[in-house]
């Protein structure tokens, strides 16, 4: 009778083993091992047990110890079982961002590992597990669809293989594939808002604002502002799930026409865009010119306003005739020209828009001096010691010195208040000048004294 | 050009008289007040009177009595008569255009002066 | 009677200083006072009419202020050429005054 031990072995892949091949009878004719794995003899006493160490096993085997007896030929089976963890385990790629709702297949490949009845396939959400599968095939897959929700934001998934060789006094051999981090996200399906001048003046700013609501997650937003090939370079303010992109926007010469304004926002693998068009225009303010800024009284004064060659413009409230860039008016200058404010407004269209312009030019008059009866009384009776404030005024432009003089000598304090006495009695000698001439005017300062009461 | 220019000071006697005048030019007397100031040896600026565009004349108080202004508008010239000088009158007197003139801006105009020498 | 009364009578001063002379009428003459400088053998030259308005070619250094009984000339930064004798002169009465002249005030090099 043959007998061999172990009579089953598990043993990792390319290792070695001890069989020990025994028979019941002294003297047996033949002992040995049949095997296709490397294997050698180790010497021992006695004829009836013979020790044989098999290496490089690779894969299950069946060594067949057989002797050979005076009461005949007998065989025994070893069961040599190899185990090895998976070559691979691995996750099939996915895009890293994927928008909320979507059904996304997982999909677990292992090739490898035996034996493969104790070795189990688990598709995970970072702990937990989605899906346990026993390996089958070659190689081996697993799937499952996971509903994409906003709070898998961040999730790592991955897939592990156990191969469990506890019943067989082993351990539990784990192998865990590469995480795959899950990007969420949300892009709604409206454009982004775009808020801008539809017109926009050469050498000015403009400020434009692009925001979106309903986003997540909402700082992982890029915007992309940009009016024709010049980018802008936006300030984003963040709100729970939406943005806002304010940037300014300088316009030369260069860009003048119609350009386009374009907001896109990128999130995940998805974008959404605005576009606007904005039209660049030049419109430089009207031109008041005036023959002289500063006149004599009695000179002609010529007023001309001229715009835009496509603007139309009103000088002082008056359009221009025939309707049109240049206005002008023909005025005699007079004193109550000084001062005078003579303004041009011009119209512009610019993409249906009335664009409005003004420019103002003050005009200076300069006449007088001038004294009069009204401003200047030739007469004042005051009683004595009273207190009054003599008062001339004289005008002109530029205003005119005045000085009031008795005898040439004496002054009358103008606009002071002044004790009355009988000093004060008497003609003076108003006289205005300035850069425009002189005039003179008497004025007479009676005192009434108390005893003529 | 409008000028001042005082003449006829010198060594007088005390208890004599003296006359001091003063052409104008650039300007009318009838239309213009004329004053005198006089300055003592290392003393300050005394004023002495004034006569008016209407001939009328005012004085210092010290003044009244002794001194007298008068003018020719046809000759355009201002006097200044001192009589009995006494010996504190040595000074160098001024001939000024009006204290106060439409414009002038006070006694803008100022002759050089003309020193008088009280002196037996 | 108007009296004019003048303040310091003499003043030390270096280049570059700040200078005040003050002035006082015994009664209101308004605005119409002028200042002088006079160097010695030399007729008085007018520098501010009306109490602060500068005459025509005196530098900006030179300012007035005041009306009615109290005024003052400042000499914002004085320069070697300022050192002289200043008056001051109220034209307002030609009637019953003394003398329409400040008693001056004599600015001298520290």
């Known amino acids: 009778q043959t007998s061999v031990s172990p009579s089953k072995v598990i043993l990792p892949r390319g290792g070695s083993v001890l069989v020990t091949c025994s028979t019941s009878c002294d003297q047996p004719k033949l002992l040995g091992i049949e095997t296709p794995l490397p294997k050698k003899e180790l010497l021992l006493p006695g004829n009836n047990r013979k020790v044989y160490e098999l290496s490089n096993v690779q894969e299950d085997s069946q060594p067949m110890c057989y002797s050979n007896c005076p009461d005949g030929q007998s065989t025994a089976k070893t069961f040599l079982t190899v185990y090895w963890t998976p070559e691979r385990v691995e996750l099939a790629p996915l895009p890293s961002w994927q928008p909320v709702g979507k059904n996304l297949t997982l999909r677990c490949q292992v090739e490898g590992g035996a034996p493969r009845a104790n070795l189990t396939v688990v598709l995970l959400r970072g702990e937990k597990e989605l899906k346990r599968e026993p390996a089958v095939g070659e190689p081996a897959e697993v799937t499952t669809t996971v509903l994409v929700r906003r709070d898998h934001h961040g999730a790592n998934f991955s897939c592990r293989t156990e191969l469990d060789l506890r019943p067989q006094g082993l351990e539990l051999f784990e192998n865990t594939s590469a995480p795959y981090q899950l990007q969420t996200f949300v892009l709604p399906a409206t454009p982004p808002q775009l808020v801008s001048p539809r017109v926009l003046e050469v050498d000015t700013q403009g400020t434009v604002v692009c925001s979106l609501d309903g986003l997540f997650p909402v700082s992982e937003a890029q915007v992309h502002l940009a009016l024709g090939d010049q980018r802008l370079n936006p300030t984003v303010t963040y709100g729970n799930d939406s943005f806002s992109a304010k940037a300014s926007v300088s316009v030369t010469a260069e860009d003048e026409g119609t350009q386009r304004l374009t907001c896109a926002v990128i999130l995940g693998n998805q974008s959404q865009e605005t576009l606007q068009t904005v039209t660049i225009y030049s419109f430089p303010a009207p031109n008041v010119i005036l023959t002289k800024p500063e006149v004599s009284e009695g000179t002609e004064v010529t007023v001309k306003c001229e715009a835009h060659p496509r603007a139309k413009v009103t000088l002082n409230g008056v359009p221009a005739q025939p309707l049109g860039p240049r206005a002008q008016l023909l005025l005699k200058a007079t004193p109550e020209d000084n001062g005078r404010s003579f303004s041009c407004s011009a119209t512009l269209e610019v993409a249906g828009q009335l664009i409005h312009k003004n420019q103002t030019r003050e005009l200076r008059v300069l006449y007088g001096p001038r004294l009069d009866e009204r401003d200047c009384p030739g007469n004042w009776t005051w009683p004595e010691n009273s207190q009054q404030t003599p008062m001339c005024q004289a005008w002109g432009n530029p205003l005119p010195e005045l000085k009031c003089l008795k005898d040439g000598t004496f002054p009358l304090p103008i606009g002071e208040s002044v004790t009355v006495t009988r000093d004060l009695e008497g003609t003076y000698l108003c006289r205005a000048r300035s850069t425009q001439g002189e005039v003179t005017r008497k004025v007479t300062v009676n005192v009434l004294s108390p005893r003529y009461e | 050009e409008v000028q001042v220019l005082e003449s006829g000071g010198g060594l007088v006697q005390p208890g004599g008289s003296l006359r001091l005048s003063c052409a104008v030019s650039g300007f009318s007397l009838s239309s213009h007040a004329m004053g005198w100031v006089r300055q003592a040896p290392g003393k300050g600026l005394e004023w002495i009177g004034i006569i008016g565009s209407s001939d009328r004349t005012y004085y210092a108080s010290w003044a009244k009595g002794r001194f007298t202004i008068s003018k020719d508008n046809s000759k355009n010239t201002v006097y200044l008569q001192i009589n009995s000088p006494r010996a504190e009158d040595t000074a160098v007197y001024y001939c000024v255009r009006d204290p106060y003139d439409s414009y002038d801006e006070g006694y803008r105009l100022w002759g050089q002066g003309t020193l008088v020498t009280v002196s037996s | 009677d108007i009296q004019m009364t003048q303040s310091p009578s003499t003043l030390s001063a270096s280049v570059g200083d700040r200078v005040t002379i003050t002035c006082q009428a015994s009664?209101?003459?308004?605005?119409?006072l002028s200042w002088y400088q006079q160097k010695p053998g030399k007729a008085p030259k007018f520098l501010i009419y009306d109490a602060s308005k500068l005459a025509s070619g005196v530098p900006s250094r030179f300012s007035g202020s005041g009306s009615g009984t109290e005024f003052t000339l400042t000499i914002s930064s004085v320069q070697p050429d300022d050192f002289a004798t200043y008056y001051c002169q109220q034209a307002y009465s030609s009637g019953s005054i003394d003398n329409a002249f400040g008693g001056g005030t004599k600015v001298e090099i520290k």
């Open positions: 009664q209101s003459i308004y605005r119409y």
